[in-house]
């Protein structure tokens, strides 16, 4: 899934403007401190449990650890969604849940986690080394996907305590750039604070109109861009393929859940590519490739786009595509 993210540049203070240092020292550190505190990389966790009563029945739980609004979740097996995986369920925070066999019951557990029970009979039933993937589309983080499977040695009905699991995928274009800006900001803040310790506290001066006065600008997504980013659901994928990384996410649920080993599958995608393909969203389509929605319309209360996520699942039909699965 790709989405467009514009990251306004944080402008460093202009050199040689010591006279305005007092003003800058008061404003910029707070701006940067806010960014540093609130900045955090979202994470997706996946846990799988094989039912003791039905050896071919699985329960998958997935969650999103981030501050954004989830607009869509897709669960699949057989590989990541969009890469040969079979979609099992699509969950939209406002449009509801859709599921296909062998999924038996998908549901929202909280506003940021879902669970899925899989049937255990039939040719399409999962096997013990099946890999399950959950993709969360959210605003403003973008699309994040993680995959996991039962640990090879786990007994039915039991599971290892959750262990840290890497995030498998972060498709939001520019997310590294944002991280870089924030990292720079935090380092710069520390630098400012160190310098501040070695100089007398500046006095507040009347505001100046001089064109030379430095302006500290904090970045925050514009309302327009927020409305445009809206994600509606989560998808879970599964497949009978051995997992490669024997790690799982730390923020796990109850200890009886087995954390799935995750597969690192980050695919860097250039901004140009994701801006070209329309992505359907709830009620309207968007020009974001692979599942994020661009919405120019209204944002639903807890969601970004379609359920409103990136340029929306509810967005101008100019970016059209139905809301479905990414």
């Amino acid at each position: 899934m790709r989405t467009e993210a514009q990251v306004p540049a944080l402008q460093p203070p202009e050199p040689g403007l010591e006279g305005a240092m007092g003003h800058r020292t008061l404003v910029l550190p707070w701006v940067l401190l806010t960014l540093c505190v609130t900045a955090g990389t979202p994470e997706v966790w996946v846990q799988v449990r094989m039912e003791a009563t039905e050896l071919s029945s699985f329960t998958i739980r997935c969650g999103f650890l981030g501050s954004g609004s989830i607009s869509l979740v897709t669960v699949s097996w057989g590989g990541p969604n969009g890469a040969g995986g079979t979609t099992l369920a699509v969950l939209h925070p406002e449009r509801g849940i859709r599921q296909w066999a062998p999924a038996r019951q998908a549901r929202w557990e909280t506003q940021s986690s879902i669970s899925l029970i899989l049937e255990g009979s039939g040719a399409s039933s999962p096997c013990a080394n099946t890999t399950f993937c959950c993709k969360f589309a959210s605003f403003p983080e973008g699309s994040w996907e993680a995959c996991g499977s039962l640990p090879p040695s786990s007994d039915p009905g039991l599971s290892a305590p959750p262990t840290p699991a890497p995030i498998l995928r972060a498709d939001l274009a520019g997310i590294l750039g944002v991280s870089g800006v924030l990292l720079f900001g935090c380092v710069y803040l520390l630098h400012l604070l160190r310098r501040h310790k070695h100089r007398p506290a500046p006095r507040l001066q009347p505001s100046r109109t001089s064109p030379q006065a430095p302006r500290a600008r904090a970045w925050a997504p514009s309302q327009a861009s927020q409305a445009a980013l809206h994600v509606p659901y989560a998808t879970i994928n599964t497949s009978c393929r051995p997992a490669t990384l024997d790690t799982a996410h730390p923020h796990g649920g109850p200890s009886w859940w087995a954390s799935l080993p995750t597969h690192a599958a980050h695919r860097p995608q250039g901004p140009a590519a994701w801006a070209s393909t329309p992505i359907p969203a709830r009620g309207s389509f968007v020009s974001v490739e692979n599942g994020l929605y661009a919405q120019a319309g209204e944002r639903p209360p807890h969601t970004g786009p379609g359920l409103t996520l990136f340029p929306d699942p509810r967005g101008p039909r100019a970016m059209e595509g139905p809301l479905g699965v990414r």
């Epitope: 066999a101 506003q111 399409s124 692979n290």
Partner: antibody, heavy 114, light 113 residues
Framework: EVQLQQSGPELVKPGASVKISCKAS????????MNWVKQSHGKSLEWIGD????????NYNQKFKGKATLTVDKSSNTAYMELRSLTSEDSAVYYC???????WGTGTTVTVSS | DIVMTQSPSSLSVSAGEKVTMSCKSS????????????LAWYQQKPGQPPKLLIY???TRESGVPDRFTGSGSGTDFTLTISSVQAEDLAVYYC?????????FGGGTKLEIK
């Protein structure tokens, strides 16, 4: 622009079968599920079932199990619904609707008459 | 199956008037996990397919005029048109988005005097 173009009207005899199509354009076909909805003349809407292109197991409304069969052809971005053992009760307009009923097809009128 | 019941079945109003129509479900449409009510409203004008108006009980679809407002929770829902326009002549359907099979109400036909 996202569009769902359905096949033309059908006049069929009782007991026969008919297969109607819904060609999608303007979005990635495999990313979204497709619903089929029946609307009898002057009546409300009835959901028949849904299918997602990368899963071969459609969902059906119990009422239409045995009556409707949903399939997709990913190579042509087309969804199909076959109706069999037709009776006059099956005369209606049938719509395809993508995703969460976000985009609707043009509708296909099926008339069952001897 | 969840049964959706709409009332009135039809109503006739003059342009500029406020209109309210009701939709009741036989079971709660509230999703306990995320506290959302999974109900949608559609507008079907003569000779056209239905068009999504509102989802999640109250979220307007992109491009839908703000004179359309959805409200309600649990089993009782309402669609309000604050100032009816001539182009609002249509049948309005509510839909259960909560659980399979997805079911629609019988519709409320809005006529303009």
């Amino acid at each position: 622009e996202v569009q769902l173009q359905q096949s033309g009207p059908e006049l069929v005899k009782p007991g026969a079968s008919v297969k109607i199509s819904c060609k999608a354009s303007g979005y990635t076909f495999t990313d979204y599920f497709m619903n089929w909805v029946k609307q009898s003349h002057g009546k409300s809407l009835e959901w028949i079932g849904d299918i997602i292109p990368n899963n071969d197991s459609p969902n059906y409304n119990q009422k239409f199990k045995g009556k409707a069969t949903l399939t997709v052809d990913k190579s042509s971005n087309t969804a199909y619904m076959e109706l069999r053992s037709l009776t006059s009760e099956d005369s209606a307009v049938y719509y395809c609707a993508s995703g969460y009923f976000d985009v609707w097809g043009t509708g296909t009128t099926v008339t069952v008459s001897s | 199956d969840i049964v959706m019941t709409q009332s009135p079945s039809s109503l006739s109003v003059s342009a500029g008037e406020k209109v309210t129509m009701s939709c009741k479900s036989s079971q709660s449409l509230l999703n306990s996990g995320n506290q959302k009510n999974f109900l949608a409203w559609y507008q079907q004008k003569p000779g056209q397919p239905p068009k999504l108006l509102i989802y999640g009980t109250s979220t307007r679809e992109s491009g839908v005029p703000d004179r359309f407002t959805g409200s309600g929770s649990g089993t009782d829902f309402t669609l309000t048109i604050s100032s009816v326009q001539a182009e609002d002549l249509a049948v309005y359907y509510c839909q259960n988005d909560h659980s399979y099979p997805w079911t629609f109400g019988g519709g409320t036909k809005l006529e303009i005097k």
